[in-house]
């Protein structure tokens, strides 16, 4: 599985968005986990809701928040208030009882923000910027997904 | 259209191992699709035991997930069923199905295998 | 698991009568329900998927509606070719059946 890397600002918010094939994964829970070191187990930051059904429902921990979009095969989580050691390597998952299938393997990198360092006054900063998609930023090859739309017969 | 055919012996002996196969034709068993079996034991109603994804995920029924064992043979184009230490409750029809959830559920069906479990 | 409580487990109607069958479920699955028909010594056959669409194939007579937990299948007008026996499932987890409804024409 390929590594995607995303960055985003310090301060800022950086949006992850990990898709899946969602007949496969039909029924089955998400979690964001955070892996300690190169071969460490990967620690849970956060899951979507218990019931399934409600997994569309935010849910946080701390400053991070999960919801997955069941049907479009789609979870998406949000690193609010980034900050430099949010920095790492981190997976998507799928969880089946106590099984976990990697989704996606995510390398977030924070940048620090030129404002700590410089006049704001020689700076613009657009009003949009104060969140970052993971899918405006250049990352490694795309994973190898299923397609989540329906089936061929 | 994709078209599904269950073949194995009818009739298997107590504590033995039942075996089907569920040959998948018209289309690919790598199509986005879950490979399920499901039984009908006489005069009652329908059972889901498991079902399997060409990657050879799988899910079963909690009440048989002991002694169920679903296999897929990407080669062959077929699916396949193992029920081991069966006892006279697990005679029925077993059918064959592909399950597209939310996608369209169970639409395409074998036409059912006799299985007998009887010494 | 999820059980699925249809009613009535059997019914009697006359050609052209409109057939009405319940399917409860013991917890929320929102409209993750399918209706099957099945005809002595046939396989089922999908009528209904998601609740409320008709599958491919399938006379417009047949409809289903509900959410949730609490579920109803309709057959319009009664035809002689709709005897048989009817269930729901549920695949919001391990799928599961109704216990079927057998249709007999008076």
């Known amino acids: 599985l390929n590594t995607t890397v995303l960055q985003g600002m310090a301060g800022q918010s950086l949006r992850v968005s990990c898709t899946y094939d969602a007949l496969k994964h039909w029924g089955r829970r998400k979690a964001w986990c955070r892996q300690l070191g190169e071969e460490g187990p990967c620690q849970r930051v956060v899951s979507t809701h218990g019931v399934w059904l409600l997994a569309f429902l935010k849910k946080r921990n701390g400053s991070t928040v999960i919801a997955d979009d069941t049907l479009a095969g789609t979870v998406t989580i949000t690193l609010k208030n980034l900050q430099a050691g949010d920095a790492g390597l981190y997976q998507c998952q799928s969880l089946r009882g106590r099984e976990a299938e990697v989704l996606q393997k995510v390398l977030v990198e924070v940048l620090e923000d030129p404002l700590d360092d410089q006049d704001a006054g020689d700076l613009w900063v657009p009003e949009e910027s104060s969140s970052f998609e993971g899918a405006q930023v250049e990352h490694s090859t795309s994973r190898n997904q299923e397609t989540s739309f329906p089936p061929t017969s | 259209q994709v078209q599904l055919q269950e073949s194995g012996p009818g009739l298997v002996k107590p504590s033995g191992t039942l075996s089907l196969t569920c040959a998948v034709s018209?289309?690919?068993?790598?199509?986005?699709?879950?490979w399920s079996w499901v039984r009908q034991p006489p005069g009652k109603g329908l059972e889901w035991i498991g079902e399997?994804?060409?990657?050879?995920?799988?899910n079963y029924n909690p009440s048989l997930k002991s002694r169920v064992t679903i296999s897929v043979d990407k080669s062959k184009n077929q699916f396949s069923l193992k029920l081991s230490s069966v006892t006279a409750a697990d005679t029925a029809v077993y059918y064959c199905?592909?399950?597209?959830?939310?996608?369209?559920?169970?639409?395409?069906w074998g036409q059912g295998t006799t299985v007998t479990v009887s010494s | 698991d999820i059980q699925m409580t249809q009613s009535p487990s059997s019914l009697s109607a006359s050609v052209g009568d409109r057939v009405t069958i319940t399917c409860q479920a013991s917890q929320d699955i929102s409209n993750y329900l399918n209706w099957y028909q099945q005809k002595p010594g046939k396989a089922p056959k999908l009528l209904i998927y998601d609740a409320s669409n008709l599958a491919t194939g399938v006379p417009s007579r047949f409809s289903g509606s509900g959410s949730g937990t609490d579920f109803t299948f309709t057959i319009s007008s009664l035809q002689p070719e709709d005897i048989a026996t009817y269930y729901c499932?549920?695949?919001?987890?391990?799928?599961?059946f109704g216990g079927g409804t057998k249709v007999e024409i008076k």
């Open positions: 399997i994804y060409h990657d050879a995920d799988t």
């Open positions: 018209g289309g690919s068993i790598s199509d986005s699709a879950w």
């Open positions: 199905a592909r399950d597209t959830k939310y996608w369209g559920g169970m639409d395409v």
């Open positions: 499932q549920q695949y919001v987890e391990a799928p599961t």
